[in-house]
């Protein structure tokens, strides 16, 4: 799998897409995970409804949504005021039994809001108590990682 | 007139199978998802599962305490959704009722059952 | 699973009261919930669907509000005909109704 880069504004909403085959996929559930380390394990951040006939349904983690338009083949994620901490790698899975099918692999690029130097009462930055379906969400810039790009750079 | 009306309960001893049937009139049978439910003497409801639109190629779904003993399927052209119940037990015992899902589009749904039937009783005894 | 806990389990009111459900979800539903009206001997009937949504030909004396974990059903006015029981139904892990309100007149 190659890795697709996802870039957001740190205190905007930022969506990322899976397309996935619905017939091969069909009946199963998906989950959103994060990659911990090159080699670790995929941490499960949110997975969709329990019952895959309601996958549409929002189902959310915290500032993490998710959706899956099963008839379409597209898993929706949305992360919700972005954070530098959700910088990262992830995974698009598909889930059968105890097992999982990497969808897609994300990175997942948390830039620095343009605005930030401007009075903070220019800023509007979606409140706690505002819905997902409210909030604003930002068109994502996506790009493949080229050839010979590392995903996990060696550490020092 | 949208009406749903079950047939096919009756008493059964434990271990036998029944088979229950649901007729769908004044609607477009295939467009929607159908689910049964029961209801014990006095007790409140339950979810059985659910079937599937055409759409979504009458996928099923159960709940967990009659998951590989009872299946729902569902018959177009005929408007009839059958639920099949194999090695009943005693607490199988209650009225079943189907019910229609309520339907937002071609795609789309929400469990919120907008039409159901009169019910029919199962009685598992020996 | 979700635990739905629906209080209280019985009651009785007057004609013309105002009456309230509650149903509280062991975790958050987000507004994944519905409410449900079943007369003695008949079969439920939908009132509130999406936590607040009046089902079509259902009298507005009967609403529903709430989100996350507590939400509650109100009659405005209770009449005669209101004489049944109710539950609630959520719908964000799989299909789980509440333990029922029997509502009597006094």
């Known amino acids: 799998h190659n890795t697709t880069v996802f870039q957001g504004v740190e205190g905007q909403s930022l969506q990322v897409s899976c397309p996935y085959d619905s017939m091969k996929h069909w009946g199963r559930r998906k989950a959103w995970c994060r990659q911990l380390g090159e080699k670790g394990p995929c941490q499960r951040v949110v997975s969709t409804h329990n019952l895959w006939l309601l996958s549409f349904l929002r189902r959310r983690n915290g500032s993490t949504a998710i959706t899956d338009d099963t008839l379409g083949g597209t898993l929706t994620i949305t992360l919700r005021n972005l954070q530098p901490h959700d910088a990262g790698f992830y995974q698009c899975q598909s889930l059968h039994g105890s097992e999982a099918d990497t969808l897609r692999k994300v990175l997942v690029e948390v830039l620095a809001d343009p605005l930030d130097h401007r009075d903070a009462g220019d800023l509007w930055v979606p409140g706690e108590s505002e819905s997902f379906e409210d909030a604003h969400v930002e068109h994502s810039i996506s790009r493949s990682l080229l050839e010979g790009e590392i995903p996990f750079p060696p550490t020092s | 007139e949208v009406q749903l009306v079950e047939s096919g309960g009756g008493l059964v001893q434990p271990g036998r199978s029944l088979r229950l049937s649901c007729t769908a009139s004044?609607?477009?049978?295939?467009?929607?998802?159908m689910s049964w439910f029961r209801q014990a003497p006095g007790k409140g409801l339950e979810w059985v599962g659910f079937?599937?639109?055409?759409?979504?190629?009458?996928?099923?779904e159960y709940t967990a305490s009659v998951k590989g003993r009872f299946t729902i399927s569902r018959d177009g052209s005929k408007s009839i959704a059958y639920l099949q119940m194999n090695s009943l037990k005693t607490e199988d015992t209650a009225v079943y009722y189907c019910?229609?899902?309520?339907?937002?589009?071609?795609?789309?749904?929400?469990?919120?059952?907008?039409?159901w039937g009169q019910g029919t009783m199962v009685t598992v005894s020996s | 699973d979700i635990q739905m806990t629906q209080s209280p389990s019985s009651l009785s009111a007057s004609v013309g009261d105002r009456v309230t459900i509650t149903c509280q979800a062991s975790?958050?539903?987000?507004?994944?919930l519905n409410w449900y009206q079943q007369k003695p001997g008949k079969a439920p009937k939908l009132l509130i669907y999406?936590?607040?949504n009046l089902e079509t030909g259902v009298p507005s004396r009967f609403s529903g509000s709430g989100s996350g974990t507590d939400f509650t059903f109100t009659i405005s006015s209770l009449q005669p005909e209101d004489i049944a029981t109710y539950y609630c139904?959520?719908?964000?892990?799989?299909?789980?109704f509440g333990g029922g309100t029997k509502v009597e007149i006094k």
């Open positions: 019910a229609r899902g309520k339907r937002y589009s071609y795609t789309y749904w929400t469990p919120a059952f907008d039409v």
């Open positions: 004044g609607f477009t049978f295939d467009d929607y998802t």
């Open positions: 079937i599937g639109s055409k759409a979504y190629s009458a996928t099923t």
């Open positions: 975790q958050d539903i987000t507004n994944y």
């Open positions: 999406d936590a607040s």
């Open positions: 139904q959520e719908y964000d892990s799989y299909i789980t």
